[in-house]
């Protein structure tokens, strides 16, 4: 008789999740010399220990502490790029501008990017059928708590000028409920971070509006200023040209505004 299993509203654990995490870890530690001493089996043990046998609506940041410790990574703190609702362009940018880092360019972000996972209370099984949805089921689920925890640590580690890429095509360019708006903004350390510079990415080719004047950007400026961090904002009118100019800064067309 099949055992009754909790049905959640979200998709289940990504297939071959353990193998994927382990393989990503091995690949990452081979490529990044500063992480080559990391034991990927211990990393997987710590990852697994954070959610296996635990109720998937009752996960805490403390559950992830061992994984966070093993994944501690010293990235240049003045080369951090945060993003909100524009992941692909942010990643394309750091693939070209190799000295800058998004969260997904770090070991922990790389391990979990685009994956889903959850377990079940009191069993050592991984749930491949369904996992809690943040809105419909619960916010303290394994995936949400993981990203909240790594995002907080990533923001805490930042210094000097921190950049954030924002999606100018969305109704809320800055969304207080996004990971950036609810976690990262509030965990930048004013004693280390001098400026937050927002890059607002335009969607339409003919969109010449100054989206830095958008009310949600003004709201972000207000939050940041109250935290004693300076704020600046730039419009990126042509993201395609922006990336091209990052690749080839000597190009004559790259002196004009992008």
């Amino acid at each position: 008789v099949p055992r009754w299993r909790q049905q959640w509203s979200g998709p289940g654990t990504t297939k071959r999740f353990p193998e994927t995490v382990l393989a990503r870890c091995v690949k990452y530690t081979e490529i990044h010399p500063e992480m080559r001493h990391v034991d990927c089996q211990s990393v997987w043990d710590a990852f697994k220990g954070a959610f296996i046998s635990k109720h998937p609506c009752n996960i805490t940041e403390e559950d992830y502490q061992p994984l966070m410790k093993l994944g501690t990574q010293t990235v240049p703190c003045n080369k951090i790029l945060l993003w909100s609702r524009i992941k692909d362009l942010a990643h394309q940018f750091t693939q070209v501008q190799r000295d800058m880092f998004t969260l997904e360019d770090t070991l922990l972000g790389y391990l979990a990017d685009d994956l889903t996972w959850c377990g079940e209370f009191n069993t050592s099984k991984i749930n491949y059928q369904s996992c809690p949805d943040w809105r419909k089921d619960c916010s303290n689920n394994p995936v949400s708590v993981f990203w909240k925890t790594v995002s907080r640590r990533f923001a805490e580690a930042a210094c000097d000028v921190v950049h954030v890429m924002l999606n100018g095509s969305r109704s809320k360019i800055f969304d207080k409920n996004s990971t950036f708006g609810s976690v990262e903004v509030h965990n930048l350390q004013p004693e280390k971070v001098q400026t937050l510079e927002a890059w607002v990415i335009h969607g339409g080719r003919e969109d010449s509006r100054d989206l830095c004047q958008d009310p949600t950007i003004k709201e972000l400026e207000s939050i940041i200023s109250k935290r004693n961090i300076q704020f600046s904002c730039k419009n990126i009118y042509r993201p395609d040209k922006f990336l091209q100019c990052v690749k080839n800064p000597e190009d004559s067309s790259c002196t004009s505004e992008i």
């Epitope: 001493h37 043990d45 697994k48 220990g49 940041e61 966070m68 010293t74 580690a157």
Partner: antibody, heavy 123, light 110 residues
């Protein structure tokens, strides 16, 4: 009161083995990283290994300690162990166990230390 | 391998003197400021003085202060007291949760 008490040190011949113990009391043992750190006579401090076991042991080692040293834990006895094999003269040191501060803002620092146990490797 | 270099290795001071110890790391510490300072007296275990470069550990007198970021850090004792003659170690926290200690600075009575 937080207490860590090391034992098991002594004289051992090169190539020999030794198991050190670190008995803990006064705190919730499962919720902290316990770190082994050593100090050669008249020299500086050097970290050896770390263990944490809220649910299953999670452990890791200094590069030089991998393969020869093994850290383990017995939660029922509130004790951490350091098994040292293939010992060499350069392993002669006082071995300390220390408790790391808890909380993500404080990890990476050692707030409570044992008194140390001396290991001498000599023929 | 990460190297933490402390200078000077020995320092002679009189009671009331201002003392500064420097610690240089071959790699940036985690978060730019994840560095601690410890005090050790002969035959005793080290005692945590300072964490995250500039935060005073519980019960440590305010004459101790720390500063620095990235790879360069300093520990200052504004007015050395008889109880402060000891050896001081810096300790950094790095990628993969690894630790490294400096070689130590012995503060002795002039």
């Amino acid at each position: 009161e937080v207490q860590l008490l090391e034992s098991g040190g002594g004289l051992v011949q090169p190539g020999g083995s030794l198991r050190l113990s670190c008995a803990a009391s006064g705190f919730s043992f499962n919720n902290y990283w316990i770190i082994w750190i050593r100090q050669a006579p008249g020299k500086g401090l050097e970290w050896v290994a770390a263990i944490y076991s809220p649910s299953g042991d999670i452990k890791y080692y200094a590069d030089w300690a991998k393969g020869r040293f093994t850290v383990s834990k017995d939660n029922s006895k509130n004790t951490v162990y350091l098994q040292m094999n293939s010992l060499r003269a350069e392993d002669t040191a006082v071995y300390y166990c220390a408790r790391e501060l808890s909380g993500s803002s404080y990890e990476g620092y050692f707030e409570s230390w044992g008194q140390g146990t001396l290991v001498t490797v000599s023929s | 391998d990460i190297q933490l270099t402390q200078s000077p290795s020995t320092l002679s001071a009189s009671v009331g003197d201002r003392v500064t110890i420097t610690c240089r790391s071959s790699q940036s510490v985690y978060g730019h400021n994840w560095l601690a300072w410890y005090q050790q007296k002969p035959g005793k275990a080290p005692k945590l003085l300072m964490y995250r470069a500039s935060n005073l550990a519980s019960g440590v007198p305010s004459r101790f202060s720390g500063s620095g970021s990235g790879t360069e850090f300093t520990l200052t004792i504004s007015s050395v007291q008889p109880d402060d003659f000891a050896t001081y170690y810096c300790q950094g926290y790095y990628s993969g949760g690894s630790y490294a200690f400096g070689g130590g600075t012995k503060v002795e009575i002039k």
